[in-house]
């Protein structure tokens, strides 16, 4: 079952996905695609990273976090109802069938007619430096093995009512999180 995330038309949608690099610079390729994760790769790729950089992206899709430290959460800019659906975050761990696949369901709600302050704000505007930490959860080993030890955490909703920017680090445990050891 997919984890569900919500956004309003015209907002930026946020789909969290994380991993912890085994060592600084030891990055793992990641792809984001529209539609559930297939057996291999991502279907309808909207963004891709390699061992070094973001090497492919399409309009409105970008990484606001620091992908070099494992924050590969996807931001979709100025969403419309057509952006609703399943998105796949695939962490392409070396080795046969080692990839970790996360299906995240994005539900787009119509914008409120009356322009009024809303508590469900664009996270980027509210916390422009959030989600740049190296992660929470156990991780000890320093090299990629052929069968990595992986911890998964999936929490059903992203906190919508952040009262304090210090809670931003807690969001690191929301969504899809793995460690690579």
């Amino acid at each position: 079952s997919e984890v569900e995330y919500r956004a309003e038309v015209g907002q930026n949608a946020y789909l969290p996905c994380f991993y912890t690099p085994a060592a600084p610079g030891n990055l793992v390729p990641v792809c984001w695609g529209k539609g559930a994760c297939p057996v291999f790769e991502c279907g309808n790729v909207v963004l891709r990273t390699d061992e070094r950089d973001v090497n492919y992206w399409t309009s409105r899709y970008w990484l606001n976090g620091d992908f070099r430290k494992g924050d590969v959460s996807l931001t979709i800019e100025n969403v419309t109802l057509a952006d609703s659906g399943i998105y796949c975050c695939r962490i392409q761990i070396p080795g046969i069938m080692n990839d970790e696949k996360f299906n995240l369901k994005l539900v787009i709600k119509p914008a409120k007619v009356t322009p009024a302050p809303t508590r469900q704000r664009d996270f980027t505007a509210a916390f422009p430096r959030m989600l740049t930490t190296r992660g929470h959860g156990p991780a000890e080993t320093q090299t990629l093995g052929s069968l990595p030890d992986i911890n998964l955490t999936q929490i059903s909703t992203l906190a919508n009512e952040l009262r304090d920017s210090r809670l931003a680090n807690d969001l690191r445990d929301s969504g899809a999180t793995i460690r690579i050891g």
Epitope: P21, P24, G25, T132, T133, G135, E140, T141, Q142, R179
Partner: antibody, heavy 125, light 108 residues
Amino acid sequence: EVQLQQSGPVLVKPGASVKMSCKVSEYTFTDYYMNWVKQSHGKSLEWIGVINPYNGGVTYNQKFKGKATLTVDKSSSTAYMELSSLTSEDSAVYYCARDADFHGNSYVGYAMDYWGQGTSVTVSS
Amino acid sequence: EIVLTQSPATLSVTPGDSVSLSCRASQSISNDLHWYQQKSHDSPRLLIKYASQSISGIPSRFSGSGSGTDFTLSINSVETEDFGIYFCQQSHSWPQYTFGGGTKLEIK
């Protein structure tokens, strides 16, 4: 204010080892990578390696592999560097330096925004 | 390995002069170039990051420019406290960093 407090100067004999520390304060230790940099007397700076304090993952400059070992103690927010099989070539000032926050997806690397005061190592018989 | 070459090695100036320090990379490093100042017996201090981005607390007389392989640190109207050694550092090959050899700024 962010501070990186390094251990004091040391005088050691050739062949010995030395372990120096870098204790941080006023920021979350596990949220920033920690670099170590060597400065030989009157010379430029050499990057030794970087450690992720969160999981202990280390990446070294090839030149310092086998010479330097980087570790951390999360409970005390302290980074350590041990230098082994010391020779006169290892006489230098060693700095710990924090990786700055990321700047944006179009940039690959980081600057070093806070530095320790340095630990002077003298190797002499 | 990306090699950074700084020039001149030494620059003798009078307070009030405006100066430019050069840092040249052996290959294109985009904007991943940072400048540091080191005064005698002190630690390096970050002056400019990503070629031209200013740092909080650093006087506005320091500015940086350049992209690709050629970079410049400019000091508008040098003050006595500015004398010391200036290093450039590239982070394009992150996490493998390299530094330039330094430019010594001294009083004429």
